[in-house]
Amino acid sequence: KESCDVQLYIKRQSEHSILAGDPFELECPVKYCANRPHVTWCKLNGTTCVKLEDRQTSWKEEKNISFFILHFEPVLPNDNGSYRCSANFQSNLIESHSTTLYVTDVKSASERPSKDEMASRPWLLYR
């Protein structure tokens, strides 16, 4: 018999490598039985997790599981970091594992001088 507790299925030590400027959806898989719990996202800052109040979120319902989605439209360089989802269920707080976003800032990467450029114009290193 399956448990009727709410379960949050973010994988432990999970990571996502994403590009700044792209859209991205961060999913929190949620299993529940009857009433859908209230779920929130937060971003880790040291040992505290700061609730993300004014961010676009949505639900996606599938047959055996639902997903509470945090939307990044677009991804920004400072979205880099670790996130966690939490559910309130029967006055209990259930927390997921954290998941880490590694954001590559394509703009600054493309602005960096190439190896060839650096070799032929070493003063670029000091500008």
Partner: antibody, heavy 119, light 112 residues
Framework: EVHLQQSGTELMKPGASVKLSCTAS????????MHWVKQRPEQGLEWIGR????????KFDPKFQGKATLTSDTSSNTAYLHFSSLTSEDAAVYYC????????????WGQGTSLTVSS | EVVMTQTPLTLSVTIGQSASISCKSS???????????LNWFLQRPGQSPKRLMH???KLDSGVPDRFTGSGSGTDFTLKISGVEAEDLGVYYC?????????FGGGTKLETK
């Protein structure tokens, strides 16, 4: 019931490449991490690395970084371990192991694939 | 990397006797989530390893309750009260707290 079916015995020449497969039934690999473990003859177990089939993210033991490549195909529910430039040190039994809901608990093991490297 | 040291290397027992295997880690396996990712596996001759115990002391389904796991931090023990023939094989501890994940060297349980 969960079952991990691994590909058959491989006999390869030094310098060659090989791709071992592990097909899961009874679970969706998107919901797991798929790990690979090496066991040389009469030796212990070594963790090679793992892949998150949901996004392709991989983690390796540094000694296998650059030697092994992990990939997966969610449409066929299959994970792969690829080795290039084989040497006699790579001769071993390789196990795939699932980790349901990415819980770091290594719950189900395949039957193993024996890789022999000989000229 | 975290080094997992198992003792003894070989354990010779009489069927029905109790057995104890030690596993020590080079650093605490207590994770920031409050869990300790320490598993025990048994590999019977000619077979794949099978998980017996996860999170130090949680017995896997189908594993007899003569197996008990205990410990915390860096020191862990697997005890078998009344060894049966089906318990013979090589026992491995494994940590999944830190990358790279690591196994102990194994303890062979055999009959005298």
């Amino acid at each position: 019931e969960v079952h991990l079916q691994q590909s058959g015995t491989e006999l390869m020449k030094p310098g060659a490449s090989v791709k071992l497969s592990c097909t899961a039934s009874g679970l969706n690999i998107r919901d797991t991490y798929m790990h690979w473990v090496k066991q040389r003859p009469e030796q212990g177990l070594e963790w090679i690395g793992r892949i998150d089939p949901a996004n392709g993210n991989t983690k390796f033991d540094p000694k296998f970084q650059g030697k092994a490549t992990l990939t997966s195909d969610t449409s066929s529910n299959t994970a792969y371990l690829h080795f290039s430039s084989l040497t006699s040190e790579d001769a071993a039994v390789y196990y795939c192991v699932s980790d349901h809901y990415g819980s770091s608990l290594l719950d189900y093991w395949g039957q193993g694939t024996s890789l022999t490297v000989s000229s | 990397e975290v080094v997992m040291t198992q003792t003894p290397l070989t354990l010779s027992v009489t069927i029905g006797q109790s057995a104890s295997i030690s596993c020590k880690s080079s650093q605490s396996l207590l994770d920031s989530d409050g869990k300790t990712y320490l598993n025990w596996f048994l590999q019977r001759p000619g077979q794949s390893p099978k998980r017996l115990m996860h999170l130090v002391s949680k017995l896997d389904s189908g594993v007899p309750d003569r197996f008990t796991g205990s410990g915390s931090g860096t020191d862990f023990t697997l005890k078998i009260s009344g060894v049966e023939a089906e318990d013979l094989g090589v026992y491995y501890c494994w940590q999944g707290t830190y990358f790279p994940y690591t196994f102990g060297g194994g303890t062979k349980l055999e009959t005298k």
